[in-house]
Interface confidence: low
Amino acid sequence: TGADTEAVVCVGTACYTAHSGKLSAAEAQNHCNQNGGNLATVKSKEEAQHVQRVLAQLLRREAALTARMSKFWIGLQREKGKCLDPSLPLKGFSWVGGGEDTPYSNWHKELRNSCISKRCVSLLLDLSQPLLPSRLPKWSEGPCGSPGSPGSNIEGFVCKFSFKGMCRPLALGGPGQVTYTTPFQTTSSSLEAVPFASAANVACGEGDKDETQSHYFLCKEKAPDVFDWGSSGPLCVSPKYGCNFNNGGCHQDCFEGGDGSFLCGCRPGFRLLDDLVTCASRNPCSSSPCRGGATCVLGPHGKNYTCRCPQGYQLDSSQLDCVDVDECQDSPCAQECVNTPGGFRCECWVGYEPGGPGEGACQDVDECALGRSPCAQGCTNTDGSFHCSCEEGYVLAGEDGTQCQDVDECVGPGGPLCDSLCFNTQGSFHCGCLPGWVLAPNGVSCTMGPVSLGPPSGPPDEEDKGEKEGSTVPRAATASPTRGPEGTPKATPTTSRPSLSSDAPITSAPLKMLAPSGSPGVWREPSIHHATAASGPQEPAGGDSSVATQNNDGTDGQK
C-alpha cells in the first residue's frame, strides 16, 4: 500500500494510527477505509492532542524523516466548486466521514479563495522544534496530490477508527507478555485502552519455553456500554512475586496470603468488579450512565441520579441521552438555517454574506469590489452573483470564466481582415504587405511601392505613416504570428502561398521563403536586412491599421 503503521493511540472510543509514506489524500483515505476507518478528524483541542501524540510516536521511530517541515493528511477536504467561507472555523472544508462543522480549527495561515480545484488539509509539523503537547500541529491546505504526484512534502497520514467501547488493558500479576490485535489489523503490546473486538494473547513466564503458559481473550460487550475480557483474577500470577510484581495486577489493593497467594481489593467507596482485578466507584454516577453529553447529577444521599443536558439539547425517552433541539424549525434565519449540535447558525446563499438589519440577515457580496474581483478584466456585480467581461480584442476563457484570452483576429471566423499579411497582437492586430508593397493609409490594403528584396513589411514605422501610395494589391495572403511554447506571440508572420495572379507582382526572392503550395509557411528574415516589425521575438510595432473589434461580455463568472 506504500504506507506502514508505525504508531497507535487509543483513547475514549477511538484509536488513531499514524502512517508514513508518500500517498495522495485519496490513496491515504482508501488505506484508512480498507481497515474500517477514515482519515482522522481533529474536531477539538483534545482530539488534536491525541493526534499529535500518535504523530510523536511515529516521528520517534521514523529515522527517514530529515525534512524540517513534515505534513500528514487528515480528513478535512473541500470539493471542487465549493468556495471558501471565511466566517466558518473550517472555512467551508468538511470532514470526510461527514458530520457538522466543528468549532475547533488551527489554520497555519490565512486561506486564499480558490474554488477551481479540490483542496485537502494536512497537519504541518515543524520537526526542528521539540514536539511539545502544548504546540499542536497547524493545519495546512493545498492540492490533494495524485497517485503519480502525491506531493513531495507529504510524509504520511493519520487514520481514525471509532468503536462502541474499549476494554482496560489486561493486568499481569507476574512476568509475561500481552499482545493485542485490533480490528484495524494493528498489533501492540501497550495500549492505554483496547478497542472492542480486539484479541489479546498472553504468554506467561520469563521466557523459558517450558514454563510458558498462553491465554487468549477477546474484548467483548458484556452489557450495554460495559466491555471486558471475560477473565477473572490477575494473569500470570506467581507465588515467587506475590503482590510485588505490578501490584499483583490489581487495580487498587493487593492482599497477600501466607502461602504466596494473593487477592485484589478495593478502597472504601469502591467495589471489586467481576474480573476480580478492577475497582469501580459505588457512586452511581461513576459508571457514567448518562450519554450524549448529559451530566450525571447525584440524588439525595448519593443513592440515585438524574441526567441533565446542556443548553440546546433535551433528554430523550430513555432519560439517559441528550438529543439536539432543532432550532431551525422556528425559521430564525433570512436565507439558510443549519442546525448544529446544541445550537444553530445562519448561512447565506452563495453570493451573499452575513450583514444587514436583524439577526441572520444576508446582503449581496460585491465580488467586483476593489481588491477582491475574481475577473481578469471587466467585472459586473449582480444580486447574488457577478459576471466577467473582456476588453475589445479579448474573449472570456478559463475554467471558471474569469480569465480573458486574446482573440486571434488573423484567423477569425470572418476570414482574413487584411489584404495581405496579418499580425496578431495582444488585444488587437496589424496588417502588413509583401515585399515591394506598402500599407495604404487605411491600414488594411497594400499599394505598390518601390521594388525591394526585403522581407514582408510590417506595420509602417512612425515616420513612414501615410507616405505610401500606389495601386492596391488584391487580397492575397494572411499571416498571423506563430505561437511560442507558452502561447506567447512571436512576431514572425505566417502566410499561405498567395495566388500568383498577373497583378500581384512578387519577386523571386520572397518566393524562396514561402512554404510549398497549400501548407503554412514561416517568413524568415534574411540576416542582412535591418530588423523590421516582423523580426525577432518582439511584437509588431503599432501602425495606423484599422482594428477589428469584438465586444465580449455577458458570460457569468463562477462564484
Epitope: Q49, R53, A56, Q57, Q129, P130, L132, P133, S134, E192
Partner: antibody, heavy 120, light 111 residues
C-alpha cells in the same frame, strides 16, 4: 494519596555513574510524564529531562544529552535517572516530578529529592 | 533557551503586607492564547510545591492570598497578605519550549 518516593543519597567518584529511582503510587503511572530536575546547594532549579512511561519516549535538556538516561518500569511504576561521567559540579539534589500529559506541563507532584555527591 | 529573570532576588515584607515578585522571560511563553508559566514555592529542606499554573490558575489546596498575572514575557506573583508560613524561595518556570527553564528564585522573608 499521590506520592513519589526517591531512593537514598549517593556518593560517587568523578567519572563514575549514578542511577536514582523514583517510585510512583496513588495514580496511574502511565498517564503522566515523569521529569527530573536538579538543584545545586543554595542554587536554582534546572530541568534535566522527561519520560512518557506509557511508551518510554524521552526528551532531554541538550546540556545533559549523552550523559543522562531516563527510563521507566511500568510493572513497578518506577522511573530512573542515570547520570554518567560524573563531575564535581554534578553534586546536586535530584528531584523527580510528574506532569500532566498534555498542554502546560507544570510539575504538580514532586519526590522528596536524592542528594548525589561527587567527590574524589 | 528561554532565560527567566526574577526580581528582586530577595524581599522583606511585614506580616499582613503585600509581596510582589516579578518574572521576565527572554521571549514570549504564550501559545494559542495560554501562558505557559508556572510558580513554585520551596521551603528549606523540601521539594518545590506548585502554587500557580498557566500564569494565573491557583493549584488546588493553595491559599487564595496567592495570585498570578501577566502574559507574553512579563509575569507577577502576588501574596496579598504575607503569613509566617509563606517564608520561602519562589521560582517561576516556563513550559512553552524545551528545555523547561526556571527563574533564579526570589527569597521572601519577614521584615
Amino acid at each position: 494519596q499521590v506520592q513519589l518516593v526517591q531512593s537514598g543519597a549517593e556518593v560517587r567518584k568523578p567519572g563514575a555513574s549514578v542511577k536514582v529511582s523514583c517510585k510512583a503510587s496513588g495514580y496511574t503511572f502511565t498517564s503522566y510524564w515523569m521529569h527530573w530536575v536538579r538543584q545545586a546547594p543554595g542554587q536554582g532549579l534546572e530541568w534535566v529531562g522527561e519520560i512518557d512511561p506509557s511508551a518510554s519516549y524521552t526528551y532531554y535538556n541538550q546540556k545533559f544529552k549523552g550523559r543522562v538516561t531516563i527510563t521507566a518500569d511500568k510493572s513497578t511504576s518506577t522511573a530512573y535517572m542515570e547520570l554518567s561521567s560524573l563531575r564535581s559540579e554534578d553534586t546536586d539534589v535530584y528531584y523527580c516530578a510528574r506532569s500532566v500529559y498534555y498542554g502546560n506541563k507544570y510539575f504538580d507532584v514532586w519526590g522528596q529529592g536524592t542528594t548525589v555527591t561527587v567527590s574524589s | 533557551d528561554i532565560v527567566m529573570t526574577q526580581s528582586p532576588d530577595s524581599l522583606a515584607v511585614s506580616l499582613g503586607e503585600r509581596a510582589t515578585i516579578n518574572c521576565k522571560a527572554s521571549q514570549s511563553v504564550d501559545y494559542a492564547g495560554d501562558s505557559y508559566l508556572n510558580w513554585y514555592q520551596q521551603k528549606p529542606g523540601q521539594p518545590p510545591k506548585l502554587l500557580i499554573y498557566a500564569a494565573s490558575n491557583l493549584e488546588s489546596g493553595v491559599p487564595d492570598r496567592f495570585s498570578g498575572s501577566g502574559s507574553g514575557t512579563d509575569f507577577t506573583l502576588t501574596i496579598s497578605s504575607l503569613q509566617a508560613e509563606d517564608v520561602a524561595v519562589y521560582y517561576c518556570q516556563q513550559t512553552n519550549e524545551d528545555p523547561r527553564t526556571f527563574g533564579g528564585g526570589t527569597k521572601v522573608e519577614i521584615k
